[in-house]
């Protein structure tokens, strides 16, 4: 492991569309990839009238947008689908929204997907 980097070996997995996509609904996903590539966890969710609805969680491929992020935080201002990624085992268990453009209350979500 490179000093100062959190190695990602597994991530929380969730798929709200598991029946349609024919996948597991929940679990722990082992992350694989080329040896020279970094691996990340991610979360995607929607905010429906203030209610958080998780879309997917799992492993994410090498992506510079995720480098050295120990926390999963979406910074885009009011996207239709929120996305965050991070480095470190199971770092996508919790995810947050901190828009860069304006100062608002963060929606910090230690969400456990329901079966």
């Amino acid at each position: 492991a490179i000093l100062g980097r959190s190695e990602t070996q597994e991530c929380l997995f969730f798929n709200a569309n598991w029946e349609r996509d024919r996948t597991n609904q929940t679990g722990v996903e082992p992350c694989y990839g080329d040896k020279d590539k970094r691996r990340h966890c991610f979360a995607t969710w929607k905010n429906i009238s203030g209610s958080i609805e998780i879309v997917k969680q799992g492993c994410w491929l090498d992506d510079i947008n995720c480098y050295d992020r120990t926390d999963c935080i979406e910074k885009k201002d009011s996207p239709e689908v929120y996305f965050c990624c991070c480095e470190g085992n199971m770092c996508n268990e919790k995810f947050s929204y901190f828009p860069e453009m304006e100062v608002t209350q963060p929606t910090s979500n230690p969400v456990t997907p329901k079966p």
Epitope: F13, V55, G58, W60, D63
Partner: antibody, heavy 120, light 107 residues
Framework: EVQLLESGGGLVQPGGSLRLSCAAS????????MNWVRQAPGKGLEWVSN????????GYADSVKGRFTISRDNSKNTLYLQMNSLRAEDTAVYYC?????????????WGQGTLVTVSS | DIQMTQSPSSLSASVGDRVTITCRAS??????LNWYQQKPGKAPKLLIY???SLASGVPSRFSGSGSGTDFTLTISSLQPEDFATYYC?????????FGGGTKVEIK
């Protein structure tokens, strides 16, 4: 080096059957989801089917549902596509492709393809 | 199903030109957008994944951008080996769907 090698294509009459195989090497086959994607002559890419790392979950395009069956033998590092009740519109080059994650973020490696021709 | 619409369907360009291809999804797909390059008689090759990330061995003249529903593939300075057909693909949900392709031809 990741390698995917398809075989089993050929000429078949409408209503007939074929089984395609995809031999994988150069990676831990039983850790990855796998896909079949096809391309009709002169046309674009169409996803056909996928299967998760252990064969527990499968998915199909509506155009092949009920006629095609995807499977895998992890002990042989091989992916299969059983194609029944073939139609002229199934004529295409069939590619197997590796899914990068459980949720198929991207199809990161592809085979060279095998041609299936359905004609009387 | 999520529809992926690419434009233009074909374009003619010269070596050294800057080329831009666009892809629009029928609904938001967040960052689940990939680009592939295909040369005649060959298998597609992953070019860019997750909107902006270059696949292994892909030259830096290729770049991707966008989010939500609108995405762009840019070739900063077209090289002779770049004449090919390019496809976008969403993996936000099943079925995986591809754009119709953009054929980049020599002017």
């Amino acid at each position: 080096e990741v390698q995917l090698l398809e075989s089993g294509g050929g000429l078949v009459q409408p209503g007939g059957s074929l089984r395609l195989s995809c031999a994988a090497s150069g990676f831990t086959f039983d850790s990855y989801s796998m896909n079949w994607v096809r391309q009709a002559p002169g046309k674009g890419l169409e996803w056909v089917s996928n299967i998760n790392y252990n064969g527990g979950y499968t998915g199909y395009a509506d155009s092949v549902k009920g006629r095609f069956t995807i499977s895998r033998d992890n002990s042989k590092n091989t992916l299969y596509l059983q194609m029944n009740s073939l139609r002229a519109e199934d004529t295409a080059v069939y590619y197997c492709a590796r899914g990068a994650n459980w949720h198929d973020t991207a199809l990161d490696y592809w085979g060279q393809g095998t041609l299936v021709t359905v004609s009387s | 199903d999520i529809q992926m619409t690419q434009s233009p369907s074909s374009l003619s360009a010269s070596v050294g030109d800057r080329v831009t291809i666009t892809c629009r999804a029928s609904q938001s797909i967040s960052r689940y957008l990939n680009w592939y390059q295909q040369k005649p008689g060959k298998a597609p090759k992953l070019l860019i994944y997750a909107v902006t990330s270059l696949a292994s061995g892909v030259p830096s003249r290729f770049s991707g951008s966008g989010s939500g529903t609108d995405f762009t593939l840019t070739i900063s300075s077209l090289q002779p080996e770049d004449f090919a057909t390019y496809y976008c693909q969403q993996s936000y949900e099943s079925p995986l769907t591809f754009g119709g392709g953009t054929k980049v031809e020599i002017k």
